[in-house]
């Protein structure tokens, strides 16, 4: 057999025995001649250096580059590969020789009284016990001890090969201290040398430090670092630590094996580094290295040592946070400190507790920010050891995209009498206030919804070509008043008004308000009618449980068939876009109402009376009249708003006050409610009567006591009452100083 790569024009050495395998008997002489084309050498089993005394290699007498190998009286141990090769090349010819020695069927290693086999306990691994045979076809079994077990080749994972040895899954013999091969020849047993079984591993899966990061201490505290190495079974570990102050007096290192669950394929080692009282010089990188000989793994962590406990705010701590309504707001408390501080949040001085809308921890989180969340938030950091406190104020500004108040009305589709002057209003609430409110318009017929046009709830008017109000050609003459600012419902609002000089044309008007965080718009249907006219008696806005009459007045010579309807709830989304369409063209959504007809010399008056008006009575009321000549129907729509009854409340408190004799006292008591409450004043629970020194103004809202006297001292009560109840506030007025004596005395 030949091995190696061919060199240029060099043939393989030729052996005198032209076989791959030669079998000879023990005690006979083995002689093989090798011829080649350049200097040759021989290699034989159990000897790589050529110092074996029994083996003789001689130059051939009959030619150059020829060597004969001779071994007289061969023994079983001479079994193996004999190789003739050219010096300095890989070119060689090999013959495998079996020396059949039935008294010694196994080839013994020259140097070993016993061998060593290394195994791992992995179920998938096999191990080869190198008990080579001097006879190729022996029946060989493997004996393991203790306890004694015998393994026989099974044609699968257990096998014996005379050139290789005995192959067996390593876990089968991992319990054993030693193994040997045994051959049976003619009922006689022959054993190989003993092999010591060494179960080894070397793999380090990982090295984990605990704590793994963010380790902070102050001078004098104890540092404990645990380093855990996870390895495969039968691994030994050397631990080594690197740390800043190597000459530490109070350093303690403890290494130990950790117990793992039985059946675990893993082993754990723990090394614990303890420094009893750290100093500043102990600050730095701590590295734990685990070494198994064939592998090293390490892990590091940084330990920070502070001179003493402290707390401070980090440079990234914000002072102003801006957000838009509905957003999630996160305000992190950025701090430097050891140990970590206790964190408490306050809003306008009141402690914040976590709930489903707000989380007050390291990060103050407001889930869905609203206007009422605007304010100053104070975060107070307290060092748990030194009790040192640091506070920082964060101003939260919540922006509101423009909201137009009138949009909340049910359906602003009032009709306007031809030729009249009308004012349209957009009341805008926005934070910051809108930087502009613009008005646009469009003719009603250009915008009336055709069936083919798609309409959505979000855009009920399919109008594309909005025109600026400066361009009022073909429309009504318009004037936009300067924006006004008003405090409405406790909020600063911007009021934009558009004055239509003469209502000549039906149109749609749109106001659009824009601020830094968004925009809002309102579309107003301005339907002009020459038809009937609606008035409300006695009030424009009744309160619930009051009575109200809707009067529809029409010229009797022009109109007939006056009828009252109420606009029903519109089925969405089909009719949403039809609001600007004259209501007369769409009677499907109208409910006919009972009414009473009166006449005078020129007009018919149809009166629809609502007794004890309720919130359900709110909505759009339609008066329909028919032209006597053309039979064309004319509609007028009026929106009725019914104010909710609200029990009296008094805004603001009366303050206790001390006044000197002869001075004046002025206090006010502002009450709200619907119906509006009556305000009364009491002194020491008796009705306060006006006289020259006691003045009540503005519906008793303001009380003035001029040139106070000692007898004006007492408990003053402001009481606001309506049919829904009373509300009251009290204050004690103290009058100081001596009463001047009068001449009468």
């Amino acid at each position: 057999a030949s091995v190696g790569l061919p060199s240029v024009s060099l043939d393989l050495p030729r052996l005198s025995i032209q076989k791959d395998i030669l079998t000879i008997k023990a005690n006979t002489t083995l002689q093989i001649t090798c011829r080649g084309q350049r200097d040759l050498d021989w290699l034989w089993p159990n000897n790589q250096s050529g110092s074996e005394q029994r083996v003789e290699v001689t130059e051939c007498s009959d030619g150059l580059f020829c060597k004969t190998l001779t071994i007289p009286k061969v023994i079983g141990n001479d079994t193996g590969a004999y190789k003739c090769f050219y010096r300095e090349t890989d070119l060689a010819s090999v013959i495998y020789v079996y020396v059949q020695d039935y008294r010694s069927p196994f080839i013994a290693s020259v140097s070993d009284q016993h061998g060593v086999v290394y195994i791992t306990e992995n179920k998938n691994k096999t191990v080869v016990i190198p008990c080579l045979g001097s006879i190729s076809n022996l029946n060989v079994s493997l004996c393991a001890r203790y306890p004694e077990k015998r393994f026989v080749p099974d044609g699968n994972r257990i096998s014996w090969d005379s050139k290789k040895g005995f192959t067996i899954p390593s876990y089968m013999i991992s319990y054993a201290g030693m193994v040997f091969c045994e051959a049976k020849i003619n009922d006689e047993s022959y054993q190989s040398i003993m092999y010591i079984v060494v179960v080894v591993g070397y793999r380090i899966y990982d090295v984990v430090l605990s704590p793994s990061h963010g380790i902070e201490l102050s001078v004098g505290e104890k540092l404990v670092l645990n380093c855990t190495a996870r390895t495969e079974l039968n691994v030994g570990i050397d631990f080594n630590w690197e740390y800043p102050s190597s000459k530490h007096q109070h350093k303690k290192l403890v290494n130990r094996d950790l117990k793992t669950q039985s059946g675990s394929e893993m082993k754990k080692f723990l090394s614990t580094l303890t420094i009893d009282g750290v100093t500043r010089s102990d600050q730095g990188l701590y590295t734990c290295a685990a070494s198994s000989g064939l592998m090293t793994k390490k892990n590091s962590t940084f330990v920070r040592v502070h001179e003493k406990p402290f707390v401070a705010f980090g440079s990234g701590m914000e002072s102003l946070v801006e957000a838009t309504v509905g957003e999630r707001v996160r305000i992190p408390a950025k701090y430097l400190g050891y140990p970590p501080p206790e964190i408490k949040w306050y809003k306008n001085g009141i402690p914040l507790e976590s709930n489903h809308t707000i989380k007050a921890g390291h990060v103050l989180t407001i889930m869905e920010v609203s206007e009422r969340d605007t304010g100053n938030y104070t975060v107070i950091l307290t060092n748990p050891i030194s009790k040192e406190k640091q506070s920082h104020v964060v101003s939260l500004v919540v922006y509101v995209p423009p909201q137009i108040g009138e949009k909340s009305l049910i359906s602003p589709v009032d009709s306007y009498q031809y030729g009249t002057t009308q004012t349209l209003t957009c009341t805008v609430y926005a934070i910051p206030p809108p930087h502009h409110i613009h008005w646009y318009w469009q003719l009603e017929e250009e915008c009336a919804n055709e069936p083919s046009q798609a309409v959505s709830v979000t855009n009920p008017y399919p109008c594309e070509e909005w025109r600026s109000v400066e361009d009022f050609q073909g429309g009504n003459k318009i004037e936009v008043n300067k924006n006004q600012f008003a405090l409405i419902e406790g909020k600063n609002k911007t009021v934009s008004t558009l004055v239509i000089q003469a209502a000549n044309v039906s149109a749609l008007y749109k106001c659009e308000a824009v601020n830094k965080v968004g925009r809002g718009e309102r579309v107003i249907s301005f339907h002009v009618t020459r038809g009937p006219e609606i008035t409300l008696q006695p009030d424009m806005q009744p309160t619930e449980q009051e009575s109200v009459s809707l009067w529809c007045t029409a010229d009797r010579s022009t109109f007939e068939n006056l009828t009252w309807y109420k606009l029903g709830p519109q089925p969405l989304p089909i009719h949403v876009g039809e609001l600007p369409t004259p209501v007369c063209k769409n009677l499907d959504t109208l409910w006919k109402l009972n009414a009473t007809m009166f006449s005078n010399s020129t007009n018919d008056i149809l009166i629809m009376e609502l007794k004890n008006a309720s919130l359900q009575d709110q909505g759009d009321y339609v008066c329909l009249a028919q032209d006597r000549k053309t039979k064309k129907r004319h509609c007028v729509v009026r929106q009725l708003t019914v104010l909710e009854r609200v029990a009296p409340t008094i805004t603001g408190n009366l303050e206790n006050q001390t006044t000197s004799i002869g001075e004046s006292i002025e206090v006010s008591c502002t009450a709200s409610g619907n119906p509006p409450p009556q305000i009364m004043w009491f002194k020491d629970n008796e009705t306060l009567v006006e006289d020259s020194g006691i003045v009540l103004k503005d519906g008793n809202r303001n009380l003035t006591i001029r040139r106070v006297r000692k007898e004006d001292e007492g408990l003053y009560t402001c009481q606001a009452c309506s049919v829904l109840g009373c509300a009251k506030v009290e204050a004690f007025f103290i009058i100081e100083g001596a009463q001047e004596k009068t001449n009468l005395e």
Partner: antibody, heavy 117, light 110 residues
Framework: QVQLVQSGGGLVKPGGSLRLSCAAS????????MNWVRQAPGKGLEWVSS????????YYADSVKGRFTISRDNAKNSLYLQMNSLRAEDTAVYYC??????????WGQGTLVTVSS | LPVLTQPASVSGSPGQSITISCTGT?????????VSWYQQHPGKAPKLIIS???NRPSGVSNRFSGSKSGNTASLTISGLQADDEADYYC??????????FGGGTKVTVL
């Protein structure tokens, strides 16, 4: 930076002895396993021996077992290979190498050992 | 001497990709994800270019990549350059607590 500087190579007769040294710098020598790898002239690399950081665990290739001894001195940041009963087939360039998560993440420059009569 | 089997030589033109295989048994390459690859220029010490089958140490070009399937590991050099001409060796741990190297592959850039 990591440096491994070798010394101790030379010519020796078959059966003779030689001691190779490897001086380490640029890393914490006492934390790492170390090994020796050799390369016969014109041939491939062959692993020779490994030693754990505190010398608790030592491994050898079968071809050198019983003849070579690996050792280290962490105080001197040095690794050694004592080679006895040298044979012609031990002729090679010997490299010391650091054992990281793999067998040789940094290598020395190599030193030639020639065994010849 | 048992070694992992590598092709004796592989060649490619500049810019091409080449792959070197390294075949062992389930006792070495197949058994562990601990195959490494080394580059050795003539007269120089080997240099680690891939560890743990496919991890590239910092400073090694991303043109070198490693993979493994069964008992065979592979090193791929993409965008071949003149400086890639060198010997390449694989190695693996074995179940016998030893380390095996491949026979080496000479890479020639045409």
């Amino acid at each position: 930076q990591v440096q491994l500087v070798q010394s101790g190579g030379g010519l020796v007769k078959p059966g003779g002895s030689l001691r190779l040294s490897c001086a380490a710098s640029g890393f914490t020598f006492s934390s790492y396993s170390m090994n020796w790898v050799r390369q016969a002239p014109g041939k491939g690399l062959e692993w020779v021996s490994s030693i754990s950081s505190s010398s608790s665990y030592i491994y050898y290739a079968d071809s050198v077992k019983g003849r070579f001894t690996i050792s280290r001195d962490n105080a001197k940041n040095s690794l050694y290979l004592q080679m006895n009963s040298l044979r012609a087939e031990d002729t090679a360039v010997y490299y010391c190498a650091r054992v990281g998560a793999t067998m040789g993440d940094y290598w020395g420059q190599g030193t030639l050992v020639t065994v010849s009569s | 001497l048992p070694v992992l089997t590598q092709p004796a030589s592989v060649s490619g033109s500049p810019g091409q990709s080449i792959t070197i295989s390294c075949t062992g048994t389930d006792s070495d390459v197949g058994g562990y994800n601990y195959v490494s690859w080394y580059q050795q220029h003539p007269g120089k010490a080997p240099k680690l270019i891939i560890s743990d089958v496919s991890n590239r140490p910092s400073g090694v070009s991303n043109r070198f990549s490693g993979s493994k399937s069964g008992n065979t590991a592979s090193l791929t050099i993409s965008g071949l350059q003149a400086d890639d001409e060198a010997d390449y060796y694989c190695n693996s741990y074995t179940v016998h607590a030893t380390v095996l190297f491949g026979g080496g592959t000479k890479v020639t850039v045409l």
